[in-house]
C-alpha cells in the first residue's frame, strides 16, 4: 500500500508569492510559493495519486503582516482551502498567547491541529478541551493512518503560551499516544511536529512504532540529487534514521517560507511496516501557475492590509536615527530602539531566580535602512517600518559562549571607518573599542547584563559561560562575516518577524524618545 | 464465520497458575489487538488486558499487574493469558474479545465486537 | 473499582422508554468513543452500540446512544421483554491505559 505525505513547515504568513529569498515579490515572473500556487500544486497530485495527505508541521503563524493584521485567521481560512489533513502546533502558534491560538485557529480549523506534549493545565484545561489533540487517526482510501503531534518543549521561552501550558518532554510524550494507537490497530504511524530535525532524528530513534517522522523549526531543507534553488541540503530526502528497534525510519522537512512542498512516496507492507521510502521537495516556482480562485481570495484580503500599512502604531517625539553615516560607525537611538524592542519581545519570566531568561541584543548597524523623523507629528506607520527594516527578516534567540561573543565584537570593528554593516548596535551590553588596538584586539571593554539576579546590573563578560542573545536571523546565518557565530552556535530558535516586534513595541509604548546613551564607547 | 473458542478453565488452589487460550478463525488475527475481560460471580464486567496487534504493546488492569501475562502466538492464530500467583478474587468468568477500529465516514469507533464464549477459572482451597 | 458510573437499575413496562446513564471522566469519555454492550446471563457479552447511534448489523434500531461531554447514554425506545439484561458502557482511559466498563445497569421489564 503506498501513501503520498505532502508536507510544508515554517510558512510563518508567506501566503503571497514571494521571491526567492522569501522577501516580498517584486518581480512576479520570478517570484515563488504562496497558498495559490501551493494548491495547484496539490491538487495536481491529488488527481494523479490515490492516497495523499497533506500536513504541515507547525508555525503557519508570525512573519509578514498578514499576521499581523489577522493574527491567524488568515492561517485557518487558506488552510481550510487547501484541505489541510492535520497541522502540528509550533512555537510561533503561541506568539499571540493562547487566546491568539484558540479564538482564531483552533475554533476555525475544519482539520485536527495536533501535539501530543503540550498538555493543559488549571482553568484552560476545560476551554481547550479538544480543540487539539494528541493524536488523529485518519482515513486514507481503506486503510487508516495515525498522526501523533510534537511541539518543541523550549516553546516557553520561545514564544507566549502562558503558565497553564506544560510542555513536556516530546519522546516521553508520544510513546503511550502510540503504544494507543498500536493498541487500537493502527499500524501506520507518522509523528508530525515542530521540534527541529535533530529531535526529529531522536524520535525516529527512540519512538517505538514511528514509521514516518515529519518536522519542522529547524528550517531544514534535504534534497536528494542536485538541489534546485539556492537551499544547500542538509542531507539526503528523506534523511533515514535506524530506530533502536532497528527499522529504517525516514525523516523529512520541507525548508520553510512555503517555498517547497515536501513530497514522500512511502510503501507500507499489509503489517505497516515501511518497505520503501522516496521523494524531493518540489519547488514552487513560477512554472508552477497560481489557482485564480486561490488567487482571488488572496487579493480580497490584501485589501485590509494595505490600509493597515498607512495607519498610526505610535509617535516618536525624537529623531530616530537610522542613517547609515550614524548606525554604521557609533550607537544610534535607531539601533537602541530596535534592541529594546528585540528583549521586550523575549519577556518571559523564567522563575525566581532570573528576572529574565535572556537581557543581550546584538544587530548589525547594515541591517537598518532608514531614518524616521519625528517632525511628520511623531508618527509612526508600518510603512515607515517597512523601510527601516525591510528585508522581512526575524529576529531569532541564540545561546552563545562568551568567547563567540567576544569574536563577534572584534569582527564589530576589524575594518571599522569604511561604512560597513557588520558594526553591532546593543542592548544588555556595554562594550567599549579602542581602534588604536590592532584588529582582532580591539574590545578593552564588555560587559554584559546580568540575568540571574534582581536587579539587572552589568558584570564583564565571561569566555566559557553560555549566554542567550537576541539577534536578527540574518546574523545567525553568519551574514555580515559573522561566520563565527553561525560556527559556534550552540542553539537557534527563530523568532518573529522583525518589523513586527518594533511595531508591537512602539503600539505598546505608545510615546518613545529612545537615547544614545553610552552602550557602545570608544577611548 | 469470525469466532473467539476459549479453553484451559477449571479449578486452581490460591498460588497456583493457570493458563487460559482463545483460538481465533474467520477473520485475520494478526491485525487486531485481543483483550481479555472476567465477570465475578455477581459483579460486572471487569478488564483485564489487552494485547496489540503484533505483541509489542501489553496493558494490564492493576487488580492484575505484575501476575498475569498477556501473549499472542499469531502464526497459530492464538490468544493466552497466562495466570500466576491466583487469589480467591480472581475466581470469575473470562472472556477473550476481539478489539475492532470501525470507520464510519471519517470517524473512528474503538469497541470490543467479537467475543469468546467464556470459561470459568475457580480459585479455592 | 469502576470509573465509570452506571445507574444499578432501570426498568419500564412494554413499550416504554428507558434510558441509562453513564458518566467517567476527560480520560475516557471525554476523549474516546464510548460503546454499549449487552450481557445475558449464560452468554457472552455482545456489542450493542457504538457513540453516536452507530449499531453493529442485527441490533435493532430501538436502541440509541449518545455522548456528550463526559457522559453517554443508552436509550431502548419501544422495551421488549428479551432486552431484559445487564448493560454496560465502555471506552478507552488514558490515563489508566486500559479499557474500562462501567458499573453495569440491570434493567428490567414490568
Known amino acids: 500500500w503506498e501513501l503520498t505525505i505532502l508536507h510544508t513547515n515554517d510558512v510563518h504568513s508567506r501566503l503571497e508569492q514571494t521571491s526567492e529569498d522569501s522577501s516580498k515579490c517584486v518581480n512576479a515572473s520570478r517570484c515563488m510559493g504562496g497558498v495559490a500556487r501551493l494548491f495547484t500544486k496539490v491538487q495536481q497530485i491529488r488527481r494523479a495519486e490515490p492516497n495523499v495527505l497533506l500536513l504541515d508541521a507547525g508555525d503557519q503563524y508570525q512573519g509578514t503582516i498578514w499576521f499581523t493584521v489577522y493574527k491567524g485567521a488568515e492561517v485557518a481560512h487558506f488552510m481550510n482551502a487547501l484541505r489541510y489533513d492535520a497541522m502540528a502546533l509550533g512555537n510561533h502558534e503561541f506568539d499571540n498567547g493562547v487566546e491568539g491560538l484558540i479564538e482564531p485557529l483552533l475554533k476555525e480549523a475544519k482539520f485536527p491541529i495536533l501535539s501530543a506534549n503540550i498538555k493543559a493545565k488549571g482553568p484552560l484545561a476545560s476551554q481547550i478541551s479538544g480543540l487539539y489533540l494528541p493524536y488523529k487517526v485518519l482515513p486514507v482510501g481503506d486503510e487508516v493512518v495515525g498522526i501523533v503531534g510534537y511541539t518543541s518543549k523550549e516553546t516557553p521561552f520561545l514564544s507566549n503560551p502562558g503558565t497553564n501550558l506544560v510542555f513536556e518532554d516530546e519522546i516521553t510524550a508520544l510513546q503511550p499516544e502510540v503504544d494507543k494507537l498500536k493498541t487500537l490497530n493502527v499500524n501506520k504511524i507518522i509523528a508530525l511536529g515542530h521540534s527541529g530535525f535533530e529531535t526529529d532524528k531522536l524520535i525516529a530513534q527512540k519512538v517505538r512504532g514511528v514509521d514516518v517522522v515529519v518536522g519542522g523549526h529547524s528550517n531544514t531543507f534535504l534534497y536528494t540529487g542536485n538541489p534546485p534553488s539556492k537551499e544547500v541540503p542538509a542531507g539526503k530526502y528523506p534523511f533515514i534514521v535506524t530506530s533502536d528497534d532497528g527499522r529504517k525510519v525516514p525523516v523529512v522537512q520541507a525548508y520553510a517560507f512555503g517555498k517547497y512542498l515536501g513530497y514522500l512516496k512511502i510503501e507500507f507492507d499489509e503489517r505497516g511496516n515501511v518497505i520503501s521510502s522516496h521523494g524531493n521537495p518540489i519547488l514552487l516556482n513560477s512554472s508552477i501557475p497560481e489557482d485564480p480562485s486561490i488567487k482571488a481570495d488572496i487579493n480580497k484580503w490584501r485589501i485590509k492590509l494595505d490600509n493597515y500599512s498607512t495607519q498610526e502604531l505610535g509617535k516618536t517625539i525624537v529623531y530616530l536615527d537610522g542613517s547609515s553615516q550614524s548606525c554604521r560607525f557609533r550607537e544610534c537611538n535607531m539601533g537602541n530602539l530596535i534592541c529594546d524592542a528585540m528583549i521586550n519581545n523575549n519577556l518571559r519570566h523564567a522563575d525566581e531566580m532570573f528576572w529574565n531568561h535572556v537581557s543581550m541584543c546584538i544587530l548589525n548597524g547594515g541591517g537598518i535602512r532608514s531614518p524616521i523623523d519625528e517632525r511628520n507629528n511623531g508618527t509612526i506607520t508600518w510603512e515607515n517600518l517597512a523601510a527601516v527594516l525591510p528585508f522581512g527578516g526575524t529576529f531569532d534567540l541564540v545561546q552563545l559562549k562568551g568567547s563567540t561573543l567576544k569574536k563577534a565584537f572584534e569582527h564589530s570593528v576589524h575594518r571599522y571607518g569604511q561604512s560597513t554593516g557588520e558594526f553591532l548596535q546593543v542592548g544588555g551590553i556595554h562594550v567599549v573599542y579602542d581602534l588604536s588596538r590592532k584588529p582582532g584586539d580591539r574590545v578593552v571593554k564588555l560587559d554584559v547584563l546580568c540575568t540571574k539576579c534582581r536587579v539587572p546590573s552589568y558584570d564583564p563578560l565571561k569566555m566559557d559561560e553560555i549566554y542567550k542573545v537576541i539577534l536578527p536571523n540574518f546574523l545567525a546565518n553568519g551574514g555580515d562575516g559573522f561566520q563565527m557565530i553561525k560556527d559556534e552556535l550552540l542553539r537557534h530558535d527563530s523568532g518573529d518577524q522583525d518589523i513586527n516586534v518594533v511595531s508591537t513595541y512602539i503600539s505598546k509604548m505608545k510615546v518613545i524618545y529612545p537615547a544614545v546613551e553610552g552602550r557602545i564607547k570608544f577611548s | 464465520q469470525v469466532q473467539l473458542v476459549q479453553s484451559g478453565g477449571g479449578v486452581v488452589q490460591p498460588g497456583r497458575s493457570l493458563r487460559l487460550s482463545c483460538a481465533a478463525s474467520g477473520f485475520t488475527f494478526s491485525s487486531y489487538g485481543m483483550h481479555w475481560v472476567r465477570q465475578a460471580p455477581g459483579k460486572g464486567l471487569e478488564w483485564v488486558a489487552v494485547?496489540?496487534?503484533?505483541?509489542?504493546?501489553?496493558y494490564y488492569a492493576d487488580s492484575v499487574k505484575g501476575r498475569f501475562t498477556i501473549s499472542r502466538d499469531n502464526s497459530k492464530n492464538s490468544l493466552f493469558l497466562q495466570m500466576n500467583s491466583l487469589r480467591d478474587d480472581d475466581t470469575a468468568t473470562y472472556y477473550c474479545a476481539r478489539g475492532h477500529l470501525l470507520r464510519i465516514g471519517d470517524i473512528f469507533y474503538y469497541s470490543l465486537d467479537v467475543w469468546g464464549q467464556g470459561t470459568l477459572v475457580t480459585v479455592s482451597s | 473499582q469502576s470509573v465509570l458510573t452506571q445507574p444499578p437499575s432501570a426498568s419500564g413496562t412494554p413499550g416504554q422508554r428507558v434510558t441509562i446513564s453513564c458518566s467517567g471522566s476527560?480520560?475516557?469519555?471525554?476523549?474516546?468513543?464510548v460503546s454499549w454492550y449487552q450481557h445475558l446471563p449464560g452468554t457472552a457479552p455482545q456489542l450493542l452500540i457504538y457513540t453516536n447511534n452507530h449499531r453493529p448489523s442485527g441490533v435493532p434500531d430501538r436502541f440509541s446512544g449518545s455522548k456528550s461531554g463526559t457522559s453517554a447514554s443508552l436509550a431502548i425506545s419501544g422495551l421488549q421483554s428479551e432486552d431484559e439484561a445487564d448493560y454496560y458502557c465502555?471506552?478507552?482511559?488514558?490515563?489508566?491505559?486500559?479499557?474500562?466498563f462501567g458499573t453495569g445497569t440491570k434493567v428490567t421489564v414490568l
Open positions: 476527560s480520560s475516557n469519555i471525554g476523549s474516546n468513543t
Open positions: 494485547i496489540s496487534y503484533d505483541g509489542s504493546i501489553k
Open positions: 465502555a471506552a478507552w482511559d488514558d490515563s489508566l491505559s486500559g479499557y474500562v
